[in-house]
């Protein structure tokens, strides 16, 4: 008769680590042994296989490693048949995963006042405790204003105001180990007494005497308190304004009128909002004068006929960048032909006799405009 | 506002072909050239050739040529870069520039080929 | 083709420190009085930008900080005061003929 000298046995494992489950017979003949698996036969893999009798595991997995294993002896040659008793592994595991908004259904539903949960995806067996995390400090269930049970995988703000936001984690310990969340979620509710930015001013680039507007806006309950500064925190008010911002106007929108800009106008303005409670929110724009500067002359050029050449036109420095184009005769080249412009070149192609004379580029923003001959002489052969 | 729009990037097989697009927006590229410059990880910068879109008139580096063909689309307002039988060499990054005068006044914003099999 | 040589391969500067980059040409780059040479900087995973053409003009928009001067094979771009945000690699290019060619580049770093 077959004897199990060693029986396997349930016992508890680590999720990942070593196990082995021992299995001994002791029979008149040769017999062959193998592993059932909730009646299954057991297939060696590099992970879980045959050591002689028993069944070795190289690191214990809670999804394929669960359920009853039995271990079978049998005599091939009378055909008898052994089984020994059922083993199972009582696995102990936790696994990360990332901090979810459960209610309520998406963060576009976020308001003040209301009932915010989140949740800690971390599972595990045994079932891990649970810590909850805001911006890296630790949460305790004494603070009146969200419930969180260290037993409970969910946080609970009530009511959720800005005093709450920040980045949420969690992390969860058992027998097993500890772990902590994958992702973490970022709550942002916004103070209503806070300053937000509705309008930032833009920079702007102006000729000299034309008038220049910033828009700027705030919102905030109650209403934000709005301010604009110059340069050297010289406030801009319609009723203080400072001898070089004379004609300064602020709308009660909040935009920026300034007019006749002359040079002394050109540098920072800040737009500040400042809200019943929070920090001010300072906004920068910079007004700028368009300028042009003096083009470079040309030197003279002599061509010779039927070749190719080009004259470079270098645009003057300005602000804006200016536009650069040619012109002959009083007319503007086309950007193909024979003679045509390409970009800030004059190009010339199979020269005749008959496109001798002045051409004239041209560069302008802004500022106005500049313009620099260049004499071409055809040289015949 | 100037701008010059480069297609993404592309990983090809060594042997294959390649055509990346550059589409102008703030002005016509029939006014301008339009010049291709390779820029292989961590190196200099190679001019390939140029474009003028208006007459389809293109130039290259003699070591691009039979390498790399620039065409261009004036009613899309976009030119192109075909590199052909692709090998490691050609892995780079490759600019597409408008060109004022011979230099490249706006770039985009670059196109990474990666050649691998 | 012209060849461009760029040096110093590297360079570390103070900060409000002066910055020259020098680049010579294998043959004159002049043409009608008209030097094209120019200036381009780089910063990683960006594409060059242009600074200066034609040997010294400035591009609009571009610091006054940044200038370049020489004319015939002999360049140079100066960057004075060194500010943290010109950090970057810098380029020469000649734009006399075809093919249009790069010097090797400059490593701009601050000490």
């Known amino acids: 008769a077959i004897v199990f000298i060693k029986q396997p046995s349930s016992q508890d494992a680590l999720q990942g680590r070593r196990a082995l489950l021992r299995c001994e017979v002791e029979a008149p003949g040769p017999v062959h042994v193998y592993w059932l698996l909730d009646g299954a036969p057991v297939q060696d893999t590099e992970r879980r296989f045959a050591q002689g009798s028993s069944l070795s595991f190289a690191a214990v997995d809670r999804l394929q490693d669960s359920g009853t294993f039995q271990c079978v002896a049998r005599d091939d040659v009378t055909g008898e048949e052994a089984r020994s008793a059922n083993a199972s592994f009582n696995i102990k595991w936790i696994e990360a995963g990332p901090v979810v908004l459960k209610h309520p259904a998406s963060e576009a539903e976020i308001q003040p006042q209301t009932q915010v949960t989140l949740r800690c995806h971390i599972d595990g067996h045994p079932r891990p405790t649970y810590q909850w995390f805001r911006d890296g400090t630790p949460l305790s269930d004494g603070q009146s204003n969200h419930t969180v049970s260290s037993k409970e995988r969910n946080l609970t703000l009530r009511p959720a105001g800005p005093e709450h936001s920040g980045l949420y984690s969690c992390c969860a310990h058992s027998a097993f180990g500890q772990a902590c969340s994958s992702q973490n979620f970022t709550l942002s509710i916004a103070d209503e007494s806070f300053a937000r930015v509705v309008l930032a001013p833009q920079d702007v680039v102006v000729a000299r005497y034309e008038e220049a507007m910033f828009h700027c806006q705030f919102s905030a309950q109650p209403p934000p308190s709005l301010q604009w500064l110059f340069e050297d925190e010289t406030p801009i008010t319609n009723r203080s304004r400072p001898p070089h911002l004379r004609r300064a106007t602020v709308f009660a929108n909040g935009s920026l009128l300034l007019t006749q800009v002359r040079p002394r106008n050109a540098g920072i303005y800040r737009c500040i909002g400042q809200g019943q409670r929070g920090p001010p929110i300072i906004l920068e724009a910079t007004l700028h004068l368009a300028e042009i500067e003096d083009m470079p002359l040309f030197e003279p050029r002599v061509f010779t006929a039927g070749s190719e050449e080009r004259v470079t036109c270098l645009p003057p420095k300005g602000l804006p960048e200016p536009s650069v184009w040619w012109e002959h005769a009083g007319v503007r080249l086309p950007t193909h032909g024979r003679v045509y412009q390409k970009g800030h070149e004059l190009v010339l192609a199979n020269i005749a006799e008959s496109d001798a004379g002045v051409y004239t580029c041209h560069a302008a923003n802004l500022a106005g405009q500049r313009r620099q001959d260049v004499n071409i002489t055809v040289a015949t052969v | 506002e100037v701008q010059l729009q480069q297609s993404g990037a592309e990983l090809v097989k060594p042997g294959a072909s390649v055509k990346l697009s550059c589409t102008a927006s703030?002005?016509?590229?029939?006014?301008?050239?339009i010049h291709w410059v390779k820029q292989r990880p961590e190196q200099g910068l190679e001019w390939i050739g140029r474009?003028?879109?208006?007459?389809?008139?293109?130039k290259y580096d003699p070591k691009f040529q039979g390498k790399a063909t620039i065409t261009a689309d004036t009613s899309s307002n976009t030119a192109y870069l075909q590199l052909s039988s692709l090998t490691s060499e050609d892995t780079a990054v490759y600019y597409c520039?408008?060109?004022?005068?011979?230099?490249?006044?706006?770039w985009g914003q670059g196109t990474l080929v990666t050649v691998s099999a | 083709d012209i060849v461009l040589t760029q040096s110093p391969a590297s360079l570390a500067v103070s900060l409000g420190q002066r910055a020259t980059i020098s680049c010579r040409a294998s043959?004159?780059?002049?043409?009608?009085?008209?030097?094209?040479m120019n200036w381009f900087q780089q910063k990683p995973g960006q594409p060059p930008k242009l600074l200066i053409y034609?040997?010294?003009n400035q591009r609009s928009g571009v610091p006054a900080r940044f200038s370049g001067s020489g004319s015939g094979t002999d360049f140079s771009l100066n960057i004075h005061p060194m500010e943290e945000d010109d950090t970057a690699m810098y380029f020469c290019?000649?734009?006399?003929?075809?093919?249009?060619?790069f010097g090797a580049g400059t490593k701009l770093e601050l000490k």
């Open positions: 520039a408008r060109g004022d005068a011979n230099y490249g006044s706006y």
């Open positions: 703030g002005f016509n590229i029939e006014d301008t050239y």
């Open positions: 474009i003028d879109p208006a007459n389809g008139n293109d």
């Open positions: 043959e004159s780059v002049d043409h009608f009085g008209v030097s094209f």
């Open positions: 034609a040997a010294s």
């Open positions: 290019q000649q734009s006399k003929e075809v093919p249009l060619t």
